[in-house]
Interface confidence: low
C-alpha cells in the first residue's frame, strides 16, 4: 500500500525581519519519508532546520514536519523537498498564509 502525502507549507512571523516556514506532510504511507528545506535548490544544513518525528495521524497513515527560519523577502529562494516511496516533489513558500498541494504521481 502506498499513499502519497498531502504537503502543506505555512509561514509565520518570527523575530523582526524573519519568518518561520513550516512544511508539513500528512496522510502518507508507508512511514519512511524525506522532508527537508532547500535554498536555491541546495538542502539546508541540519543545524538550520527543526524536524518533527514521523507519527501516526489516526487514519492508518503518518504525518511529520520540518521548519526553518528565513529572512522575509527571500521566500522565493526556498522550497520544501519531499521524497516518499521513490517519488519526490518540491513545494514553494506561499506568498500568502497557506499553500496546500497534493502530490500526484
Amino acid at each position: 500500500r502506498r499513499v502519497p502525502p498531502m504537503v502543506n507549507v505555512t509561514r509565520s512571523e518570527a523575530s523582526e525581519g524573519n519568518i518561520t516556514v513550516t512544511c508539513r506532510a500528512s496522510s502518507f504511507y508507508p512511514r519512511n519519508i524525506t522532508l527537508t528545506w532547500r535554498q536555491d535548490g541546495v538542502s539546508l544544513s541540519h543545524d538550520t532546520q527543526q524536524w518533527g518525528d514521523v507519527l501516526p495521524d489516526g487514519n492508518g497513515t503518518y504525518q511529520t514536519w520540518v521548519a526553518t527560519r528565513i529572512c522575509q523577502g527571500e521566500e522565493q529562494r526556498f522550497t520544501c523537498y519531499m521524497e516518499h516511496s521513490g517519488n519526490h516533489s518540491t513545494h514553494p513558500v506561499p506568498s500568502g498564509k497557506v499553500l496546500v498541494l497534493q502530490s500526484h504521481w
Epitope: 512511514r31 527537508t36 507519527l55
Partner: antibody
Framework: QVQLQESGPGLVKPSETLSLTCTVS????????GHWIRQPPGKGLEWIGM???????DYNAAFISRVTISVDTSKNQFSLKLSSVTAADTAVYYC?????????????WGQGTLVTVSS | EIVLTQSPGTLSLSPGERATLSCTAS???????LHWYQQKPGQAPRLLIY???NLISGIPDRFSGSGSGTDFTLTISRLEPEDFAVYYC?????????FGQGTKLEIK
C-alpha cells in the same frame, strides 16, 4: 549531554532469552526513537531493530521470529529481548538514538555490552 | 535486502595522504538515507556523515562524502593519525537497514 548506556547479563545460556536495557539521558524517548545493533567479535555491524516514539517497532526480518523491542518512557529506557539464542548470537550489543533530521541515522551510541552465549 | 559492498577491505596509507573509500549498493539507495560511521578499536561507531554528504557538527572538514544511486564515496583529503579506523556505510532506504562490511584504514 546525550548518553546511552546498555545493561544486562554478559553471559546467557543457549536456548535462553537475552535481555538488555538501554537507559538514556539528555533526551526523551517520547521525542527520539531508538535502535539496537550488534557486532559479533571481529565482524561488522548488524541492525536488529528499532522503536519509534509512538511505540511502533521495525525489525530485521532475520530476527523477527524471536526479537521484541519495547520502551518505558517513564524510566527513559528501551529494551531488547532476543529468544532462543545460540552461540551465533555472541556479540557486542549497542543501543543508539534515531537522529532527528539525519534521516534516521544513528547519531548517538551507547558504548556497547558484550553478551556471550555459552553453557 | 540491500547489500552494501565496501572496497577496499583494507586500505594502507600514510598520514598526509588522501583516502578514498567506496560503498556500492546492490540496488538504488536514496542519497538521503546513506550514512557513514567511523569505529575505533574498543569503541562504539560514531556518525560522521549523514545523507551522503552532510558532515556532522564537530567532524573535521577533511572528511567529505559524495555519490548517488548505487555508488557512494567517503573521502579523507589529508589523513591525520586519529583517522585510522574502520569505516562503515549504512543505508536506511529499505528495511532491513544494512551496513557495509567495513573498510579498515591502517597506517602504512
Amino acid at each position: 549531554q546525550v548518553q546511552l548506556q546498555e545493561s544486562g547479563p554478559g553471559l546467557v545460556k543457549p536456548s535462553e532469552t537475552l535481555s538488555l536495557t538501554c537507559t538514556v539521558s539528555g533526551f526523551s524517548l517520547t521525542t527520539y526513537g531508538g535502535h539496537w545493533i550488534r557486532q559479533p567479535p571481529g565482524k561488522g555491524l548488524e541492525w536488529i531493530g528499532m522503536i519509534w516514539t509512538d511505540g511502533w517497532t521495525d525489525y530485521n526480518a532475520a530476527f523477527i521470529s524471536r526479537v521484541t523491542i519495547s520502551v518505558d518512557t517513564s524510566k527513559n529506557q528501551f529494551s531488547l529481548k532476543l529468544s532462543s539464542v545460540t552461540a551465533a548470537d555472541t556479540a557486542v550489543y549497542y543501543c543508539a538514538r534515531k537522529g532527528h533530521g539525519y534521516y534516521y541515522a544513528m547519531d548517538y551510541w551507547g558504548q556497547g555490552t558484550l553478551v556471550t552465549v555459552s553453557s | 535486502e540491500i547489500v552494501l559492498t565496501q572496497s577496499p577491505g583494507t586500505l594502507s596509507l600514510s598520514p598526509g595522504e588522501r583516502a578514498t573509500l567506496s560503498c556500492t549498493a546492490s540496488s538504488s539507495v536514496s542519497s538521503s538515507y546513506l550514512h557513514w560511521y567511523q569505529q575505533k578499536p574498543g569503541q562504539a561507531p560514531r556518525l560522521l556523515i549523514y545523507s551522503t554528504s552532510n558532515l556532522i557538527s564537530g567532524i573535521p572538514d577533511r572528511f567529505s562524502g559524495s555519490g548517488s544511486g548505487t555508488d557512494f564515496t567517503l573521502t579523507i583529503s589529508r589523513l591525520e593519525p586519529e583517522d585510522f579506523a574502520v569505516y562503515y556505510c549504512h543505508q536506511y532506504h529499505r528495511s532491513p537497514f544494512t551496513f557495509g562490511q567495513g573498510t579498515k584504514l591502517e597506517i602504512k
